[in-house]
């Protein structure tokens, strides 16, 4: 008794797929595989398959049902913090070759990394024109202010909304200040936060307000405090710089905007007699902490002149170092003071039309605004590598 095995039905490739090998007929133990076109993947029911091969059985049937070649779907793209996504190919279209466009919230954010255009590729990932699978980054625009010029020298002016949107009020022990960098860092003076270096959560950080005692402000909390390793507390003010990492990003708007860090070319805007602006809630001429945010426009002082002013007692020799810059009037009367510590001395970069931090309020004479004495500020440009390292590492 002998029997001939039945040939199997000719395999019809699914749409967007092909059969291999192609034979005139398929008999017992013959097999075929299905390969999908680029951008399509094998599916059996709802389940994806890595590969598909069917074998012809003795009864003339295939051992597996024909799969489908289903178009790859990258799925809804991830939300972009401080940005949005647009569907360019069609509303909600997320399949192979679909295009989406990420963009950042206008005015206050700018896109880093790439142009924001992503395509759904055959591997199922949204991919930028540079081949990146990760999201672009919306970085806050820095140095925007309602003030457009440094102007002439005057002091004790009340700040208006949007004038110093990087201004941060730091409470915790004493009143101090800082300046917002990016959307989750605060630049300040080491001496202002030294006591809290091991208890970062004790710092009460407020921004987006003009009035020191106002209940209307944006609250931020500290995750970590980074004091410059070269700073020695109670032994001068060299390296008087610190960074506070916030535990959450703040939302950038016209009242909360980071200050720019100085570019390499920044020193050309910080020469002797160039005007910088210091702001804060520190002591005023009346001897009390200011209720309203105040600012003063003051000129940079020749470094040798400043060094000489602080060579005489009670100041120890070498008080003014190359890591400091001085600002103020020889006649006195315009100065930062206690309570302003950690705040930014800012300058207008006339090329970029953005404000940048040139100095950090650090120290000065016992009597603020004293004639022949000047406010001393940490020279931020000397610390750009340190700042960038901390921010990139943490």
């Amino acid at each position: 008794y002998t029997s001939t095995a039945q040939p199997c039905p000719y395999p019809m490739a699914p749409p967007n797929g092909h059969v291999s090998p192609v034979q005139a007929k398929y008999i017992l133990k013959d097999s075929f595989s299905i390969f999908c076109e680029t951008g399509y993947e094998l599916l059996q029911g709802h389940l994806p398959l890595k590969s598909f091969t069917a074998v012809c059985q003795k009864d003339g049937s295939w051992d597996r049902p024909m799969p489908a070649c289903s178009i790859v779907d990258c799925g809804p793209p991830d939300d972009l913090p401080s940005g949005r996504v647009e569907y360019i190919t069609g509303p909600g279209v997320t399949t192979y070759k679909a295009v989406i466009q990420y963009s950042c919230e206008e005015t206050f954010y700018t896109m880093k990394v790439n142009d924001g255009k992503y395509v759904c590729e055959a591997d199922g990932f949204w991919t930028s024109s540079k081949g990146e699978k990760s999201l672009p980054v919306c970085e806050p625009v820095c140095g925007l202010s309602a003030r457009t010029t440094g102007g002439r020298i005057y002091g004790g002016q009340k700040a208006k909304p949007g004038d110093f949107p990087w201004q941060v009020l730091i409470l915790g022990g004493t009143t101090a200040a800082g300046a917002l960098l990016y959307d989750n860092w605060v630049l300040t003076a080491a001496h202002a936060v030294y006591e809290q270096k091991h208890d970062a959560s004790a710092l009460d950080i407020r921004m987006g307000t003009l009035k020191r005692l106002s209940p209307h402000y944006t609250q931020a909390w500290s995750e970590a405090v980074f004091i410059h390793e070269g700073y020695t507390h109670d032994a001068g003010f060299d390296n008087d710089i610190a960074l506070i990492k916030l535990n959450n990003k703040v939302v950038i708007n016209s009242n909360i905007t980071p200050i720019c860090l100085p570019r390499k070319e920044a020193e050309s805007f910080m020469r002797t007699d160039d005007i910088g602006t210091a702001s804060g809630w520190g002591l005023t001429q009346r001897g009390f902490l200011a209720r309203n945010l105040m600012y003063v426009d003051i000129p940079i002082v020749d470094h040798q002149k400043c060094t000489a002013a602080y060579e005489k007692p009670p100041y120890p020799r070498g008080s003014v170092t190359a890591n400091m810059l001085c600002a103020g009037l020889e006649s006195g009367g315009k100065d930062s003071c206690r309570g302003d510590s950690g705040g930014a001395l800012v300058f207008l970069d006339s090329e970029t039309e953005r404000w940048f931090v040139g100095g950090i309020v650090s120290w000065g004479s016992m009597n603020c605004g004293e004639a022949g004495q000047y406010g001393v500020y940490t020279k931020v440009i000397n610390y750009i590598p340190w700042i960038e390292n901390i921010i990139s590492d943490f």
Epitope: Y40, E41, L43, P48, S70, I71, V72, D73, G75, P76, D79, R84, V85, E86, Y87, I88, G90, P91, G92, V93, T94, T95, Q101, S103, E105, G124
Partner: antibody, heavy 116, light 111 residues
Framework: QVQLVESGGGVVQPGGSLRLSCAAS????????IHWVRQAPGKGLEWVAY????????FYADTVKGRFTISRDNSKNTLYLQMNSLRAEDTAVYYC?????????WGQGTTVTVSS | EIVLTQSPATLSLSPGERATLSCRAS??????????IHWYQQKPGQAPRLLIY???NLESGIPARFSGSGSGTDFTLTISSLEPEDFAVYYC?????????FGQGTKLEIK
């Protein structure tokens, strides 16, 4: 809560124009694509047009292409539909509806009647 | 364009009964990961309301008696036990490509 409020409907003669508005609140308007959908009296739903979140991509049903223009003003949280060369068959309740992938929120609609 | 055909046009049932509404697409509206069919309920004088998205996901705030299933070209909306407020018109809609289209609707009425 999310709210979409349409306005601008009314009676217009064939060949006339009308501009519909949809005021949005309760969500970040600039982050979402928005659609116009219409429903003729006693009939089913018909998708009319879509505009992406930033306004750079727009799509239309063939029945309105070249006559209707969808636009948005993200600073005002408002969607618009400029309807020109109106026909009797454009008579319907016009709804604006939120989202890029399906219609998760709808306005209550504004009625457009095209009649001589 | 993709044509969606709903059946039946009218469904007469009593409260407590199970309702099964069908929606058939003229071509596949399923990808490797998603099924691009959504279901809406509309009552007289009201705007439609989203019930089910991507064929089987229940929209928040919608009772669990509503469920969706299907893939490829055939989809189903099921209401496990009808409540008086469920009697309305039900539409399926695809978002596979533009133009997005709706089915002609199924009217669910009290028997």
């Amino acid at each position: 809560q999310v709210q979409l409020v349409e306005s601008g409907g009314g009676v217009v003669q064939p060949g006339g124009s009308l501009r519909l508005s949809c005021a949005a609140s309760g969500f970040t308007f600039s982050n979402f694509g928005i659609h116009w959908v219409r429903q003729a009296p006693g009939k089913g739903l018909e998708w009319v047009a879509y505009i992406s979140s930033g306004g750079s991509a727009v799509f239309y049903a063939d029945t309105v292409k070249g006559r209707f223009t969808i636009s948005r003003d993200n600073s005002k949280n408002t969607l618009y539909l400029q309807m020109n060369s109106l026909r009797a068959e454009d008579t319907a309740v016009y709804y604006c509806a939120k989202s890029d992938r399906y219609f998760d929120y709808w306005g209550q609609g504004t009625t457009v009647t095209v009649s001589s | 364009e993709i044509v969606l055909t709903q059946s039946p046009a009218t469904l007469s049932l009593s409260p407590g009964e199970r309702a099964t509404l069908s929606c058939r697409a003229s071509q596949s509206v399923s990808s490797s990961s998603y099924r691009y069919i959504h279901w809406y309920q509309q009552k007289p004088g009201q705007a439609p309301r989203l019930l089910i998205y991507y064929a089987s996901n229940l929209e928040s705030g919608i009772p669990a008696r509503f469920s969706g299933s299907g893939s490829g070209t055939d989809f189903t909306l099921t209401i496990s036990s009808l409540e008086p407020e469920d009697f309305a018109v039900y539409y399926c809609q695809h978002s596979w490509e533009t133009p997005w289209t709706f089915g002609q609707g199924t009217k669910l009425e009290i028997k």
